[in-house]
Structures are given as C-alpha cells and as structure tokens.
C-alpha cells in the first residue's frame, strides 16, 4: 500500500505520457489522476512501465472501481491485465468479445492461467451459452479449451457452435466429453451428404452409438484406424466383421497392429474364428 | 517438421530408476502410438512397447514386464518411459519412435538416450 | 517369438556393385507386416523400406525389397558410398514385434 502524500509543485500529470516512467511509485500515486488514467487507459500499453509501477496504476484504478472495472477500461487494460487477480476478475462484466479477444491476445503463447480461465468462465456464463463467434475466438487461443470443460458444461454448448470445432481442438477430450459432443455434432452436420458428413463427424465418433457406427459402415466411408482406435468400445463389440470391414474399408488391414489394443482386442475376442479368417490378416480370436 | 525430442545421457547407480521423456512435435499426438526399442551391444534392437496416447493402453514385451513402465501426457505431447530396479543389463540407448495407428513400423524415431547403470 | 536372422553379419562392397542384403524369420511372416531400416553410426535408425517392398520417403530408387513367407531380402542394385550404413529388418506380424541382428555394410 503506497501512503497518501502531497503531489509535488508541477509534477501533476496533465496526461499519461512517458514522461510518467520517471515517477517514484509515490509521485505516481499523488500526481496521477485515477479517472484521467482510466478514460486513458489505452495509452498505458505503449508506455515501459516497470512493474513495481503498474502496481501502483492498478492501485488506482482499484479505489476508483471498488466494485469492478467498467467494459471501457477492462478492454484497454492490456499488460495491466496480467496484474489481475482472478477475484478482481470476478468483479467484471464483459460482454464484448472484442474485450475478451483484447485481454487474451494479452497471454498469448502462455498457458491458460487462472486468470484467463476466471475471464472465459465469466465471459461465457454472462452470454449464457458458448457461442460459435466465442468458440472460435476460445479455441483459436486455445486449442485444448473445449475438453477442459466438464460434460456439464459441454452440455450448454448449443449444436450451431460445433461448426467452430476444429478437429485438434477434440484432441485432449475424453470419452464423457464426447458422448455430450457427438449428439450435437449429429445434429449440426445432419443436412450434409454422406462423405461431407463423414470428414465432419470423424473427429467426435469418440461418442458415437453402435447404430450409427452400423449406418456408417453402409456408406463407403474408410475409417482410418486412428478414428477406430477412439471409437468407445462398447460401441465396438456388436459390429460384426463384415461390418468392422466395411468401415474401415482399404484400411481394415491396419487391425493387424492394432490387435493388442482396446478396442481391437476386445472385439476380435469377440468374434468366430472363422468370420476373423475372412479377413486374412492373421488375427487371432 | 516432426520431431521425437529426448533427453540427454543418464548414469544412474544399480537398483535406481530412471524416467525418459519424448516430447513429440510436428504432428497429431494422438494419431500415432508410441513405441520404444533398446538398443544394446550385446542384443542388437528390441522392442519394449507401446502405448496408444488415446487411450492410455500399453502394450509390452514380456522381457520388459516390471521392467519398463509406459505413460503420456496428451496436453504436453509427451511421452514417457520409467526403468526400474536397474541393472547392467538395462545400460543400452533408449528410443522413443512413433507407429502410425494401424502400421507395424516406425516411420519417425527419437534422438535416443544413452543409459548407462553403473556404481 | 519369431526370430529373424540376418546375413550377412558384416559385408563390403564396392562402387557400383550390386549387394543383397537377407532376413530369414523363424516362422512365415505376411509380407505386408516385415520392414527394413537404415542406421548411420551415431545416429538414430529410420525407416527405409516398409511392406516388404515400399521405399520410405527419400529413399533413393536403386534400393529395392522383396521376398514372402520366411525369406526377404533388401538389394541395393549399384552401391555408393552413402549407402554404407548397419541394416535392421523388423517384423510386426506377431508379438513381440522383433528386429534382425543387423547387417553392417561398409564400403570397399
């Protein structure tokens, strides 16, 4: 806590300029006007402020705002941003995604910090659902951000917004995400044909049901054996050879590396020696 | 351009453990098992293992049950493999080397790293 | 397991000469899961020939592989000097997946 002192003669700051790097930490607190730097906040960016002093801005805007930044200053915050503790985060409403898109280019590169994820989680709860604009934005950040959400909060993710998701985006989801997931992919790509349909889907089959994998296996799709392989496997037992054939098309020979791996081995146990002979890959059941 | 990245060379004493990383780059982490093979002047190649990054299920040669101890962590594209109870046996270069899910071989391998067991 | 024996253990060649290199497994092996790989001293092995016969990428077009069931072979059809390197075949048709002791080829 810096003490309350007299600003010294001349030294009231009529603007912030750089001029203000050569404050003392007290001189900043004295001379600076806390409502001049917050209607001139986006000035503080272009400024090397140490950090000791930035401290100090915070401080200010702090006594200003007791209950919470406003949007005009929160969207200027800039590096001021990483000064933030997730409690003054949750003091925020941010509405705007061009705020939420200014204080996440602010951590780029990083990893999501407790602060990033109090901003995303406030964000997303004050649209009352995850968008696909706010998808996008969210997983162009952060390629992992959909599958560090719980089911739950997967479940308010409304079927529209999956054309957001790209396929390394599911890559870290576990199977409880993408059983919440693939329903709403289903829905989203319902109107696309067959093949369209299938590079769509492909990425969220993790949750997909015996029967579709069954109606898939009607239409020429070709699974490679990295999709098959994330398939649940209890989705995976009931297929016939025939059908496991059929899916995986030209690929189906790949079965042969995979055949100590869940789902593979559990289902070739499952079948007739004879049906597995079909395939003449040497598997054993 | 994909990269199987290992750690440097390891003396470790008889009866430790040692725990070798392969960070991955370049590609789809979980699109490829990860497999590892010893190489030994006394035995040529030998394959250890593999696991499927997906899923977290390992594969192992049986020579290396209670020997070697396969792990991933997916958000970090990192895959690793524990050595226990040490020997001069297990002094080898370890690799690391990625098998696309549905092949036999190893298109990809690491940089290796030499472990040498000795007190 | 199946073993696969390679021959021979040493060899060199000279400039231009045509070299085959052998595996012999233990028991038949499906063609599509036997493959070869390069190794230069200090380095780290790569893939060089998979399915029996399928050049990896950038490997050069006088290397060729073939064989079925017990016998493959690797032949380089005119050796050059950056050909000299230790060759491994490897077999993924049963478990445990296991490698050739090696050929080491040098050149004369």
């Known amino acids: 806590e810096v003490e309350k002192t007299a600003c010294p003669s001349g030294k009231k700051a009529p603007e912030i300029d750089e001029s203000l790097i050569f404050y003392k930490k007290w001189e900043l607190e004295a001379c600076v006007d806390a409502a001049l730097l917050a209607t001139q906040m986006d000035r503080v960016n272009a400024i090397p402020f140490t950090y000791e002093q930035l401290d100090v801005l915070k401080h200010k805007l702090d006594e200003l705002y007791p209950q919470g930044y406003p949007e005009s200053v929160i969207q200027h915050l800039g590096y001021l941003f990483l000064k933030m503790s997730p409690e003054d985060i949750r003091k925020w409403n941010v509405t705007s995604l061009e705020t939420l898109k200014a204080l996440l280019e602010v951590n780029k590169g990083h990893e999501m910090s407790p602060q990033v994820a109090t901003l995303i989680d406030r964000f997303v709860k004050g649209r009352g659902q995850l968008d696909k604009d706010t998808l996008d934005t969210l997983t162009a950040f952060y390629p992992g951000y959909l599958c560090s959400l719980s089911p739950e909060e997967l479940s308010s993710v409304p079927p529209s917004s999956i054309w957001a998701v790209r396929p390394q985006d599911l890559d870290t989801c576990d199977p409880r995400q993408l059983d919440v997931l693939y329903p709403k992919a289903r829905l989203a790509f319902q109107n696309m044909n067959g093949s369209e349909y299938f590079v769509k889907i492909q990425s969220f089959l993790g949750g997909a049901p015996t029967e579709d994998l069954k109606a898939l296996s009607q239409q020429n799709v070709s699974m490679d054996l990295a999709t098959f392989m994330k398939l649940r496997t209890d989705a995976v037992l009931p297929l016939t050879v025939a059908e496991v054939q059929k899916l995986l098309g030209p690929h189906v020979e790949g079965l042969k590396a995979e055949e100590r791996h869940r789902p593979v081995r559990d289902w070739i146990l499952r079948q007739r020696q004879d049906d597995l002979d079909t395939l003449g890959l040497g598997l054993q059941g | 351009e994909v990269q199987l990245q290992q750690s440097g060379p390891e003396l470790v004493k008889p009866g430790a453990s040692v725990k070798i990383p392969c960070k991955a780059s370049?590609?789809?982490?979980?699109?490829?098992?990860m497999d590892w093979v010893k190489q030994s002047h006394g035995k040529g190649l030998e394959w250890i293992g593999d696991?499927?990054?997906?899923?977290?299920?390992?594969i192992y040669n049986q020579k290396f049950n209670g020997k070697a101890t396969l792990t991933v962590d997916k958000s970090s594209s990192t895959a690793y493999m524990e050595l226990r109870s040490l020997t001069s046996e297990d002094t080898a270069v370890y690799y690391c080397?990625?098998?696309?899910?549905?092949?036999?071989?190893?298109?990809?391998w690491g940089t290796g790293t030499t472990v040498t067991v000795s007190s | 397991q199946i073993v696969l024996t390679q021959s021979p253990a040493i060899m060199s060649a000279s400039p231009g000469e045509k070299v085959t290199l052998t595996c012999s497994a233990s028991?038949?092996?499906?063609?599509?899961?036997l493959c070869w790989y390069r190794q230069k001293p200090g380095s780290s092995p790569e893939l060089w020939i998979y399915?029996?016969?399928n050049l990896a990428s950038g490997v050069p077009a006088r290397f060729s592989g073939s064989g079925s069931g017990t016998s493959y072979s690797l032949t380089i059809s005119s050796m050059e000097a950056e050909d000299a390197a230790s060759y491994f075949c490897?077999?993924?048709?049963?478990?445990?997946?296991?490698f050739g002791g090696g050929t080491k080829l040098g050149m004369k």
């Open positions: 490897h077999q993924w048709s049963n478990y445990p997946y296991t």
């Open positions: 696991i499927n990054p997906n899923t977290d299920d390992t």
């Open positions: 370049g590609y789809t982490f979980t699109d490829y098992n």
């Open positions: 080397s990625r098998r696309l899910i549905g092949t036999g071989y190893f298109d990809v």
């Open positions: 028991s038949s092996v499906i063609s599509t899961y």
């Open positions: 399915s029996t016969s």
